[in-house]
Interface confidence: medium
Amino acid sequence: AHYNTEILKSIDNEWRKTQCMPREVCIDVGKEFGVATNTFFKPPCVSVYRCGGCCNSEGLQCMNTSTSYLSKTLFEITVPLSQGPKPVTISFANHTSCRCMSKLDVYRQVHSIIRR
Amino acid sequence: AHYNTEILKSIDNEWRKTQCMPREVCIDVGKEFGVATNTFFKPPCVSVYRCGGCCNSEGLQCMNTSTSYLSKTLFEITVPLSQGPKPVTISFANHTSCRCMSKLDVYRQVHSIIRR
């Protein structure tokens, strides 16, 4: 089959843009750390990089291969208000590199960490 | 309370970066359109803008207020392979503006669309 080169270029561009790589995402601080329901953060979210995008095959998953940690200062508010908003510094995982890994490898990796 | 102004600025900057706005995301084409399990797309994902980020309150949700449509050409593969990959042009919703809306309003909006 003969394909229009413009179509091939645009498809290639789509591959590029959707590849598995660190992407800027908004993380809900409370959900990330499973804090008490009476504790709130302002802002409620922080911006970090996490692996995301698509892999070429169903059996692959976009996973982080290296991680740094970012310290961010937020206001913590505990209800009922015993005091005003308190600045707290929290460390967030920031994915610095990613790879499409087989889901089986991911499963093994996670379970080996749990077993330690 | 006395606050370090550098902290106040960095907190404000976090609000800015996590605000509800159109964000570039990867959409799984098959999941987006609920296609048959024997149909695959290459690439499997496309890059579009969708509303994302955080709202200031639990009762608010980041929702699109305006949408454009982008046409993207992909290869469609049907198993068993009766023919080679076939170029198909598909239209994807691309969010162009967003707003934090009350979850109640979102619920009403969705249900009014369903009822029509």
């Epitope: 802002p43 | 309370a1 006395h2 606050y3 370090n4 102004t5 550098e6 106040l8 600025k9 907190i11 404000d12 900057n13 609000w15 800015r16 200031n56």
Partner: antibody
Framework: EVQLVESGGGLVQPGGSLRLSCAAS????????IHWVRQAPGKGLEWVAV????????YYADSVKGRFTISADTSKNTAYLQMNSLRAEDTAVYYC???????????????WGQGTLVTVSS | DIQMTQSPSSLSASVGDRVTITCRAS??????VAWYQQKPGKAPKLLIY???FLYSGVPSRFSGSGSGTDFTLTISSLQPEDFATYYC?????????FGQGTKVEIK
């Protein structure tokens, strides 16, 4: 050209109220913090309050806390200072001032309005 | 609150003179100090921010230095338009506080 224009000053009796406005133009209003700074006749400068029009965060000097409220209307590019329970010591020229840039580490006021005089007297 | 103490409170100088104004903070404020110039009946103008950075459009004869608690504003060669009151301001913590001012007069 960046401009800040205050209005709403005047003579008010002790215990009275007044609302000052600061109309901003020539820059993206949500990109900068907006401060109110006052200067009593023949005296030095005193910071009053600040707002981030972007997030709505506000901070006040202890001398005005509970009596003054700073707010911003991003659709009008205007900041306000609602002053209640006014006292003689609140008499001053009130300036609104723009913070230099949200990316700078610390507050520094790069543009100021012309000021509006508030006189609290019976 | 952090106190900012300026000295001198006033000084007389001639055109061409080198003028130095100092400001002392009651506690460490890192480099979070700005300097302003104010003329009678006018709003203050920003000269220096973050202790030593010259604000855009400000003549290079103005310079700032210092960190921690001691800060200096220097005018290398005083010009006729420089006769005014100068204020230092810390913004390390809320509330930002100003010095009491230094009035530079013609000798």
């Amino acid at each position: 050209e960046v401009q800040l224009v205050e209005s709403g000053g005047g003579l008010v009796q002790p215990g009275g109220s007044l609302r000052l406005s600061c109309a901003a133009s020539g820059f993206t209003f949500t990109d900068n913090w907006i401060h109110w700074v006052r200067q009593a006749p023949g005296k030095g400068l005193e910071w009053v309050a600040v707002i981030s029009p972007y997030s709505g965060a506000t901070y006040y000097a202890d001398s005005v806390k509970g009596r003054f409220t700073i707010s911003a209307d991003t659709s009008k590019n205007t900041a306000y200072l609602q002053m209640n329970s006014l006292r003689a010591e609140d008499t001053a020229v009130y300036y609104c001032a723009r913070d230099a840039d949200y990316k700078y580490a610390f507050w520094a006021f790069d543009y100021w309005g012309q000021g509006t005089l508030v006189t609290v007297s019976s | 609150d952090i106190q900012m103490t300026q000295s001198p409170s006033s000084l007389s100088a001639s055109v061409g003179d080198r003028v130095t104004i100092t400001c002392r903070a009651s506690q460490d404020v890192s480099t979070a100090v700005a300097w302003y110039q104010q003329k009678p009946g006018k709003a203050p103008k920003l000269l220096i921010y973050s202790a030593s950075f010259l604000y855009s459009g400000v003549p290079s004869r103005f310079s700032g230095s210092g960190s921690g608690t001691d800060f200096t504003l220097t005018i290398s060669s005083l010009q006729p338009e420089d006769f005014a009151t100068y204020y230092c301001q810390q913004s390390y913590t809320t509330p930002p506080t100003f010095g009491q001012g230094t009035k530079v007069e013609i000798k």
